[in-house]
């Protein structure tokens, strides 16, 4: 039951997070424009990965979109790519991870294709996540750097006492969001990927148990359950089955840095 | 169309109050701003203000946010504009306008005059 | 707050002529967002309340005469007159819609020959 569980959460996990990367990646609101020790404007300037928007007091909004490829900064581009490629994996992955659902019967599917494909998708979305958060620390870094450049010559003379003010830019929601999102995916993968141990069908040498009955070494090998996977021969003769009723899949759960979840 | 009504003149003694109100018509009152704006006879425009009908929200030039308040009442689809301590120096017509693209104000109502007098 | 100067404060000129009045602003008004300037003209004529020529510099408001042009970027703008008509006698404004609080220039008096 645990495994079936831990896949499912894993799942739900992860596509909520996939959700919000591709909410992320389509959010306007990547950088915004910086209100503190600013002039008050009546004008408010905010960039996404895709077009730039202007909302006026007045109520209106104008967004106009990059219609130019070559003429865009190539740390843009890299976000954009890491946040498609996420998107992509993630789709995949999600796509991989129905067919790989415990509690979905698909024909004669195998406990060993079902782990495969568990372990595929919790790959997939590991990635998937760190695409995501990539590209997002990769644009915050740059809004970073320019809105410390800006802030270096913020009020560029134009000689007289005419002067210019630089609209600086400080992180919008979609960074947020992005980050959040990534950091689901991320754990939804792993859950997948602890949930694939569960699933993978056991090592069929099952290990000899020995009971000592009237002097003689009689060989008892326990079936109807699934062995645990045991590292090393077992010398001491103890008893590795404890005999009591346990579902299939029921497995040792150990502490995980992701037990928070 | 697009109008703005704005109530009478008013000639009031210093020291007093006076609320002056604009009633729009012809557009949906809580999507646009109202501007309030004071010209004094023969002088230039100033920008007093704006309220946000539909959430209340204002935005005061610094230097009349003691003399006047904005409010909005959305049931009777309305603009109001409270002028408080009133002195000779407030004499003015008062004009409401609505904000439009470009912040700018493209209807305005006919204005009040008010006349602080002893 | 941000000063707009308009020059000269009054002209006189005859029916038919062309003409130029000037509106400098203290800082500039283009928003870098949409490369938009944010600057206003009006024209008022007495007893009347101010009405909208342009917007956002050099746009025309609808149903205003296309002898009326807006131009300039930055802090330095200009309002074109192209054949002057006797019904344009009015006040003419610019007003900054960029920064709060938003003013108005004193305003260039248009009087007819």
């Known amino acids: 039951m645990a495994v079936t569980a831990c896949q499912g959460l894993g799942f739900v996990v992860s596509l909520i997070g996939i959700a919000g990367i591709i909410a992320a990646t389509c959010m306007d609101q990547w950088s915004t424009q910086d209100l503190y020790n600013n002039p008050v404007t009546a004008v408010f300037n905010y960039q996404g990965l895709w077009r730039s928007c202007v909302r006026e007091s007045s109520g209106f909004t104008e967004c106009r979109g990059y219609f130019t490829l070559l003429g865009l900064p190539a740390m843009l581009q890299a976000v954009r790519a890491l946040m498609i490629v996420g998107i992509v994996l993630g789709a995949i992955g999600l796509l991989v991870s129905i067919f790989a659902l415990k509690c979905i019967r698909i024909g004669s599917m195998e406990d060993s294709a079902k782990a495969n494909m568990t372990l595929t998708s919790g790959i997939m979305f590991i990635v998937s996540g760190l695409c995501a958060i990539a590209g997002v620390s990769v644009f915050a870094n740059m809004l970073v750097t320019n809105f410390w450049m800006s802030t270096a010559n913020m009020y560029t003379g134009m000689g007289g006492m005419v002067q210019t003010v630089q609209t600086r830019y400080t992180f919008g929601a979609a960074l947020f969001v992005g980050w959040v999102a990534g950091g689901l995916t991320l754990i939804g993968g792993v859950m997948m990927c602890i949930a694939c141990r569960g699933l993978a069908p056991e090592e069929t040498n099952y290990k000899a148990v020995s009971y000592h009955a009237s002097g003689h070494s009689v060989a008892y090998k326990p079936g109807g359950f699934k062995a645990s996977t045991g590292f090393g021969s077992n010398t001491k003769n103890k008893k590795i089955y404890d005999g009591g009723a346990r579902t299939e899949d029921e497995v040792q759960s150990y502490p995980s840095k992701h037990d928070y979840v | 169309q697009v109008q703005l009504q704005q109530s009478g003149r008013e000639v009031v003694r210093p020291g007093t109050s006076v609320k002056v109100s604009c009633k729009p018509s012809?557009?949906?009152?809580?999507?646009?701003?109202i501007d309030w704006v004071k010209q004094r006879p023969g002088q230039g425009l100033e920008w007093i203000g704006g309220?946000?009908?539909?959430?209340?929200?204002?935005v005061y030039n610094e230097k009349f946010k003691a003399k006047a308040t904005l409010t909005a009442d959305k049931s009777s689809m309305t603009a109001n504009m409270q002028l408080s301590s009133l002195t000779s120096d407030d004499s003015a017509v008062y004009f409401c306008?609505?904000?439009?693209?470009?912040?700018?104000?493209?209807?305005w109502g006919q204005g009040t005059l008010v006349t602080v007098s002893a | 707050d941000i000063q707009m100067t308009q020059s000269p404060s009054s002209l006189t000129v005859t029916a038919g002529e062309k003409v130029t009045m000037s509106c400098k602003s203290s800082?500039?008004?283009?928003?870098?967002?949409?490369?938009?300037?944010?600057l206003t003209w009006y024209q008022q004529k007495t007893g009347q309340p101010p009405k909208l020529l342009i917007y956002?510099?050099?746009t025309r408001e609808s149903g205003v005469p296309d002898r009326f042009t807006g131009s300039g970027s930055g802090t330095d703008f200009t309002l074109t007159i192209n054949s002057v008509q006797a019904e344009d006698l009015a006040v003419y404004y610019c007003?900054?819609?960029?920064?709060?609080?938003?003013?108005f220039g004193a305003g260039t008096k248009l009087e007819i020959k």
């Open positions: 306008a609505r904000r439009v693209r470009g912040n700018s104000f493209d209807s």
């Open positions: 012809g557009y949906a009152f809580t999507n646009y701003l």
């Open positions: 309220i946000n009908p539909g959430s209340g929200d204002t």
């Open positions: 800082q500039s008004l283009l928003n870098s967002g949409n490369q938009r300037n944010y």
């Open positions: 956002w510099a050099s």
């Open positions: 007003q900054n819609n960029y920064y709060y609080p938003l003013t």
